[in-house]
């Protein structure tokens, strides 16, 4: 496969990753799909430094990240270990709140207006951030 050595147009490079910030909203699954079609993934936050970088770019707006617990435990979309990794939840979150009246609980994580994380209904149309790593071999299958 080929390697990506620079970020695509309209993406922002930071610490050997490329980031794209939406200015419109989608449900979590549709945002996830959008990133994957760009050969990327919803942003995975692995450090306080990366948290501050993303927060600076999104401003005080609810924004999806690549973290969900739709199948039980919390999981990052790229396989990064949740239990041992960076976390920045708001106090008393995640709470899987059922009181919103939309059916079910809250299975998808987003940045809130102050940057800290909250779990929310995955169908809400929030903005999102895509991320892809530089110098990573693409997923192109080998020629047969």
């Amino acid at each position: 496969g080929s390697e990506r050595t620079c970020c695509p147009v309209n993406w922002v490079e930071h610490e050997r990753s490329c980031y794209w910030f939406s200015r419109s909203g989608k449900a979590w699954a549709d945002a996830d799909n959008y990133c994957r079609l760009e050969d990327a993934h919803l942003v995975v936050v692995t450090s306080w430094e990366e948290q501050k970088f993303v927060q600076h770019h999104i401003g005080p707006v609810n924004t999806w990240m690549g973290l969900h617990d739709q199948n039980g435990p919390w999981k990052w979309v790229d396989g990064t270990d949740y239990e041992t990794g960076f976390k920045n939840w708001r106090p008393e979150q995640p709470d899987d709140w059922y009181g919103h009246g939309l059916g079910g609980g809250e299975d998808c994580a987003h940045f809130t207006d102050d940057g800290r994380w909250n779990d929310d209904v995955c169908q809400r149309p929030y903005r999102w951030v895509c991320e892809t790593e530089l110098d990573k071999a693409s997923q192109e299958p080998p020629l047969l």
């Epitope: 080929s2 549709d30 149309p125 693409s138 192109e140």
Partner: antibody, heavy 121, light 106 residues
Framework: EVQLLESGGGLVQPGGSLRLSCAAS????????MIWVRQAPGKGLEWVST????????YSADSVKGRFTISRDNSKNTLYLQMNSLRAEDTAVYYC??????????????WGQGTLVTVSS | DIQMTQSPSSLSASVGDRVIIPCRAS??????LNWYQQKPGKAPKLLIY???SLQSGVPSRFSGSGSGTDFTLTISSLQPEDFATYSC????????FGQGTRLDIN
């Protein structure tokens, strides 16, 4: 000039297989996701399948899942649709198109001229 | 899936007429809407993307408007080459198309 040219359509019996190709030119093929859309005679357009620029991610309509496989060969600037277990209701003109995504929304441009697939005994 | 409804399925008009073609989504799709023109035996051609942005090379007599669930394609002064089928498409979620509105000569 950006161009897409489909081939591989034809008459096939129910349960049979066919592989469609879409040859691309005039743009950096590997930088764009690509799609297949079909149109049954006298009907509207129906999205079939999409593949990312690298080929690493695909997704398809429920109506073809498990039967149709989208793939691409970026070294040949070619998109494919492998169609197995064909049914009469798969009879349609099949179009390939380039997916353009800039602002979070997406659109399809240009489209190939289409290739007709007829499933009949 | 999100359903896209185009009614009427056909519309008659004359050259020079102002024509408005509606499209309705089964749920809020914000501005994730595109319009395509298709002539018999030909491939679809993109006219409008993101509800109101005119595709390069498309005549300015075409315009799109709307947001949420209700959208319109307007042709300000119908030309002979505009008689065709017009389809809307949403890309908020898994892509779906309307059934199309056929524009006929009156």
């Amino acid at each position: 000039e950006v161009q897409l040219l489909e081939s591989g359509g034809g008459l096939v019996q129910p349960g049979g297989s066919l592989r469609l190709s879409c040859a691309a030119s005039g743009f950096t093929f590997s930088s764009y996701a690509m799609i297949w859309v079909r149109q049954a005679p006298g009907k509207g357009l129906e999205w079939v399948s999409t593949i990312s620029g690298s080929g690493g991610y695909t997704y398809s309509a429920d109506s073809v899942k498990g039967r149709f496989t989208i793939s691409r060969d970026n070294s040949k600037n070619t998109l494919y649709l492998q169609m197995n277990s064909l049914r009469a209701e798969d009879t349609a003109v099949y179009y390939c198109a380039r997916r353009i995504a800039v602002t979070g929304t997406e659109w399809y441009d240009p489209w190939g001229q289409g290739t007709l697939v007829t499933v009949s005994s | 899936d999100i359903q896209m409804t185009q009614s009427p399925s056909s519309l008659s008009a004359s050259v020079g007429d102002r024509v408005i073609i509606p499209c309705r989504a089964s749920q809020n799709i914000s501005s994730y809407l595109n319009w395509y023109q298709q002539k018999p035996g030909k491939a679809p051609k993109l006219l409008i993307y993101a509800a109101s942005s005119l595709q390069s090379g498309v005549p300015s007599r075409f315009s799109g408007s709307g947001s949420g669930t209700d959208f319109t394609l307007t042709i300000s002064s119908l030309q002979p080459e505009d008689f065709a089928t017009y389809s809307c498409q949403q890309t908020y979620s898994t892509p779906t198309f309307g059934q199309g509105t056929r524009l006929d000569i009156n």
